[in-house]
């Protein structure tokens, strides 16, 4: 069964940036993806998040699994360089977590590094992971081009930058990756597409928000996803089935710092890719290992 944590997710979340610590088992689909690219000179290491779809498959953003090249060519990292942690709560203590290597890394064939269109990817795990209270799949949405409705509230979790005083430029230039030790989460509303498009079009630079993306966040800022949260699932509770569905994947944000005023986070619209995901997983919808909310 998918999208049913053993611990019920809270209905209210305090006003990640501006988030709070997650309790263990609250996001049992949450995966930490660590990439150590030894083919680069010097070796490069980074991390992102992902979401468990079944015992063997992780959904994430393509930009997490693209080799961090000196050009804009889209080449996936080698599977040997990917480690996935599931059931992880505190990154300082991986003893209770399940770690797995990758059997396959699959980037969407149309992923575009210039605008992050089609920012979606899959990792097939070397061995199926045992499911339990802290390791459970999330549900995939229905095939729905509209995506989540404006103003719907979703939750997103990650171990990314949780300190709003650390600037993105500092992190990029220092080469360090500032993780929050404990999984953070935040509740964010879906922003109307037109409002988000307008907010990004007013900026200098190429900030196109395509139909394969949606935005979430607050006009006043203060709560947001940030570097290192990339690929994490934006989940919404399906009213009918009462299951959590992955509607978005943390993709990108504006040039300003995370959590800035009128800078919405941009997410891959997963509902546009349901067929592609099933096709890669080689699993017809009807007998899905995790499942689609129908």
């Amino acid at each position: 069964e998918c999208g049913q944590p053993s611990r019920s997710l809270p209905s209210l979340v305090k006003r990640i940036i501006g988030g709070r610590n997650a309790e263990p088992g609250l996001f049992p689909w949450q995966a930490l993806i660590v990439v150590e690219d030894t083919s680069r000179v010097p070796n490069d290491k980074w991390f992102g998040s992902g979401a468990l779809l079944s015992e063997s498959w992780i959904l994430t953003a393509a930009h997490v699994l693209r080799s961090q090249r000196r050009d804009t060519t889209v080449i996936p990292v080698s599977k040997e360089h990917v480690t996935v942690y599931l059931g992880l709560h505190d990154v300082r203590d991986k003893s209770g977590a399940v770690n797995s290597s990758a059997a396959r890394v699959v980037l969407h064939p149309d992923f575009n590094i210039q605008n992050y269109n089609h920012d979606i990817a899959l990792v097939q795990l070397q061995e199926p992971v045992p499911l339990g209270p802290h390791v459970m799949p999330v549900c995939l949405p229905r095939l729905e081009p509209e995506g989540p409705s404006p103003h719907m509230l979703g939750l997103v979790a990650g171990w990314g930058i949780s300190n709003p005083n650390v600037t993105v430029d500092e992190i990029i230039s220092s080469g360090t990756r500032t993780l929050s030790d404990v999984l953070q989460y935040v509740k964010l509303p879906v922003v109307p597409h037109a409002e988000c498009k307008t907010s990004y079009e007013s900026r200098s630079g190429n900030y196109s928000v395509t139909e394969n993306m949606f935005c979430a966040g607050y006009y006043e800022g203060g709560k947001d996803t940030c570097l290192g949260d990339s690929g994490g699932a934006f989940v919404i509770l399906d009213d009918l089935s009462q299951r959590w569905v992955v509607q978005g994947l943390v993709s990108w944000g504006g040039p300003e710092e995370c959590g800035s005023k009128q800078v919405y986070g941009v997410y891959t619209k997963v509902s546009n890719y349901v067929d592609w995901v099933w096709e890669q997983m080689g699993s017809p919808q009807g007998r899905a290992p995790g499942g689609t909310v129908s």
């Epitope: 000179v41 804009t72 080449i75 590094i113």
Partner: antibody, heavy 114, light 112 residues
Framework: QVQLKQSGPELVKPGASVKLSCKAS????????INWVKQRPGQGLEWIGW????????KYNDKFKDKATLTVDTSSNTAYMDLHSLTSEDSAVYFC???????WGQGTLVAVSS | DIVMTQSPSSLAVSAGEKVTMTCKSS????????????LAWYQQKPGQSPKLLIY???TRESGVPDRFTGSGSGTDFSLTISSVQAEDLAVYYC????????FGGGTKLEIK
């Protein structure tokens, strides 16, 4: 250590074709693309194209689309460039590079003359 | 296609002097998603293959002396050699990798 060893100099007649090779060693050949660059005597560098050995994907500079064909043989860790319908304009040194230009071959001189 | 223009085409300096050469691109090389400028600098000494010095506009390749510094963003970039040495005699090329690849025409550095 990483090495890219290119084939020796070629003297070819106008209208003929030539196949240059670039043998890689010291790294996993399929992890990175191979680029080819042209340099005419006393001139600058021109990018011809690249090939990604893991899936044979290629990209070309429009100028060289009908001039060069890039291939690889993963069993021998070797990249090849075929140059067709040669003219005096194709007389140049051709370099291969890999691991995002961290490593370069020594270059192959192609001289086109009747 | 992105056009890369380097200036000057040649310059002569004495050992120990500071030298700056520039490179302009016909469109911005800053990727708003990755927040990187896709511009590299190469050194080619006479009779040798090119050598990568700088990538992402300002990141020095490992093993490159710290007298070589790259700077700039968007469309305007420069390479500075803080104290020119005799072994720096070479042609210096910039190259964009924002959309495929294009080299600039080169700047020939001669030592007086």
């Amino acid at each position: 250590q990483v090495q890219l060893k290119q084939s020796g100099p070629e003297l070819v007649k106008p209208g003929a074709s030539v196949k240059l090779s670039c043998k890689a060693s010291g790294y996993t050949f399929t992890t990175d693309d191979i680029n080819w660059v042209k340099q005419r005597p006393g001139q600058g560098l021109e990018w011809i194209g690249w090939i990604y050995p893991r899936d044979d994907r290629t990209k070309y500079n429009d100028k060289f689309k009908d001039k060069a064909t890039l291939t690889v043989d993963t069993s021998s860790n070797t990249a090849y460039m075929d140059l067709h319908s040669l003219t005096s304009e194709d007389s140049a040194v051709y370099f291969c590079s890999s691991l995002e230009d961290t490593y370069w071959g020594q270059g192959t001189l192609v001289a086109v003359s009747s | 296609d992105i056009v890369m223009t380097q200036s000057p085409s040649s310059l002569a300096v004495s050992a120990g002097e500071k030298v700056t050469m520039t490179c302009k691109s016909s469109q911005s090389l800053l990727n708003s998603r990755t927040r990187k400028n896709y511009l590299a600098w190469y050194q080619q000494k006479p009779g040798q293959s090119p050598k990568l010095l700088i990538y992402w506009a300002s990141t020095r390749e490992s093993g490159v002396p710290d007298r070589f510094t790259g700077s700039g963003s968007g469309t305007d970039f420069s390479l500075t050699i803080s104290s020119v040495q005799a072994e720096d005699l070479a042609v210096y090329y910039c190259k964009q990798s924002y959309n495929l690849y294009t080299f600039g025409g080169g700047t020939k550095l001669e030592i007086k």
